[in-house]
């Protein structure tokens, strides 16, 4: 969470941004809020990126002005125009690229004053893992798969019954480069699993952490997955 203040004569406004992460190839949002101003035509929103000449996006007089927009953002950005008057200056970003990572500035000018705040935008790839029982294996085993990760994550297994156990000797993890030559598919196999136990496959890099749980009993298989972004907010 970054709060910036701006001074315009006697007036300053508070601008707040949230560090966030973008998933390569998907659409993302760079969050920014400011003190609301009902005079839409008096609001100017400028998004800038450190190291880039030109603007990422500009919104003024109630509409976009992309005349100064940098080529790398062409056709990829939009503000939530109907939410500007309530203080939302967040930026939608289409088809997030690895090169979109960096420091952004959300600059606001309203009839109340000026303000700005920086935002650190991380880019990578992260996806939910899916765990299945691998019936093809010679012994009972579990297969944990996640289709898209970058940078290369670490993978660890855990068990509810054998808490604190090290499963590195009885698991095998591989990383397969996807067709776009950036992200990778993660596959990890855990061998010699026992019935009536809950196992967790944890995949983590500096952007995100994902966990897949599976419980295998004689009568059913229960699964659960979750994904959390790290260092956000």
């Amino acid at each position: 969470l970054i709060i910036g203040f701006g001074i315009s004569g006697k007036h300053f406004i508070t601008v707040t941004t949230f560090t966030s992460a973008g998933n390569i190839g998907e659409d993302g949002t760079l969050s920014c809020t400011f003190e609301p101003d009902i005079k839409l035509n008096g609001i100017v929103i400028q998004w800038l990126k450190e190291g880039i000449k030109g603007l990422v996006h500009e919104f003024k007089e109630g509409k976009d002005d992309l005349s100064q927009q940098h080529e790398m953002f062409r056709g990829r950005t939009a503000v939530f125009a109907d939410q500007v008057v309530v203080g939302n200056a967040s930026l939608r970003l289409k088809n997030v690229q690895l090169t979109d990572a960096g420091t952004y500035t959300c600059y606001i000018h309203t009839s109340k004053g000026k303000g700005n705040a920086n935002l650190e935008y991380k880019t990578g790839a992260f996806s939910m893992p899916e765990i299945n029982v691998d019936y093809n294996a010679s012994s009972e085993s579990l297969r944990c798969e996640a289709p898209r990760w970058f940078p290369q994550p670490t993978v660890a297994w855990a068990s509810q019954v054998d808490q604190g156990a090290n499963f590195s000797e009885v698991s095998n993890t591989s990383f397969e480069l996807n067709s776009e030559n950036v992200t990778m598919k993660v596959v990890s196999v855990l061998y010699n699993v026992t019935i009536n136990n809950t196992y967790s496959c944890m995949i983590e890099n500096d952007i995100a952490k994902a966990t897949g749980d599976i419980k295998v009993t004689d009568s059913e298989v229960k699964r659960r997955s979750q994904l959390e972004l790290l260092n956000s907010g």
């Epitope: 509409k63 992309l66 005349s67 056709g75 289409k94 067709s179």
Partner: antibody
């Protein structure tokens, strides 16, 4: 409401330059949230995006046509234009102009289209 | 470039019936997809953008769904004016590309 109208020669000789103009009425070409694009459709075939322009003059072209395409804008006339050089029979198509959202980038509305035939 | 593939090429449907048209992208386009209707001698008309948002003035019988690489346009009850060619278009990355079209004809 906003309307677009293509105009230009219906017949162009091989190796010459195809030139079309799109006139925008019912709204300003300087509307900030839009690009202005060209799309073509050979007879009986599908649609191909040619490129777009912003009112400030910045352009983006389809790489398959980039070496032959020029799109320009005249804000004083509320018009934008397409030039396609070194044409062949494969460039025979209905050419449409359209307003293109800055993002989302859908095309709406479209001109009615103009058929350009490349033949000697 | 991203290749858009539509199926079937032709769909024969009786008036009042449901029509389901498919569009597949060669790689993920997230939800950055639009659908258009084109009648003979006319320009295409925008139906759906953002994969599922109906354009202004488009009847509720038209609905879009899907994300990533698989998309569907559904016409819940075909009217006589709906017989036309339908195109999908991705705007996820340049160059923007269209599918080859699906012709919906009267059965």
């Amino acid at each position: 409401q906003l309307q677009l109208q293509e105009s230009g020669p219906g017949l162009v000789k091989p190796s010459e330059t195809l030139s079309l103009t799109c006139t925008v009425s019912g709204g300003s070409i300087k509307s900030g949230s839009y690009y202005w694009g060209w799309i073509r459709q050979p007879p009986g075939k599908g649609l191909e995006w040619i490129g777009n322009i912003y009112y400030s003059g910045s352009t983006y072209y389809n790489p398959s046509l980039r070496s032959r395409v020029t799109i320009s804008v005249d804000t004083s006339k509320n018009q934008f234009s397409l030039k396609l050089s070194s044409v062949t029979a494969a460039d025979t198509a209905v050419y449409y102009c359209a307003r293109e959202g800055s993002y989302p980038n859908q095309f709406d509305p479209w001109g009615q289209g103009t058929l350009v035939t490349v033949s000697s | 470039e991203i290749v858009m593939t539509q199926s079937p090429a032709t769909l024969s449907v009786s008036p009042g019936e449901r029509a389901t048209l498919s569009c597949r992208a060669s790689q993920s386009v997230s939800s950055n997809l639009a659908w258009y209707q084109q009648k003979p001698g006319q320009a295409p008309r925008l139906l759906i953008y953002g994969a599922s948002t109906r354009a202004t003035g488009i009847p509720a019988r038209f609905s879009g769904s899907g994300s990533g690489t698989e998309f569907t346009l559904t016409i819940s009850s075909l009217q006589s004016e709906d017989f036309a060619v339908y195109y999908c278009q991705q705007y996820h990355s340049f160059p923007f590309t269209f599918g080859g079209g699906t012709k919906v004809e009267i059965k």
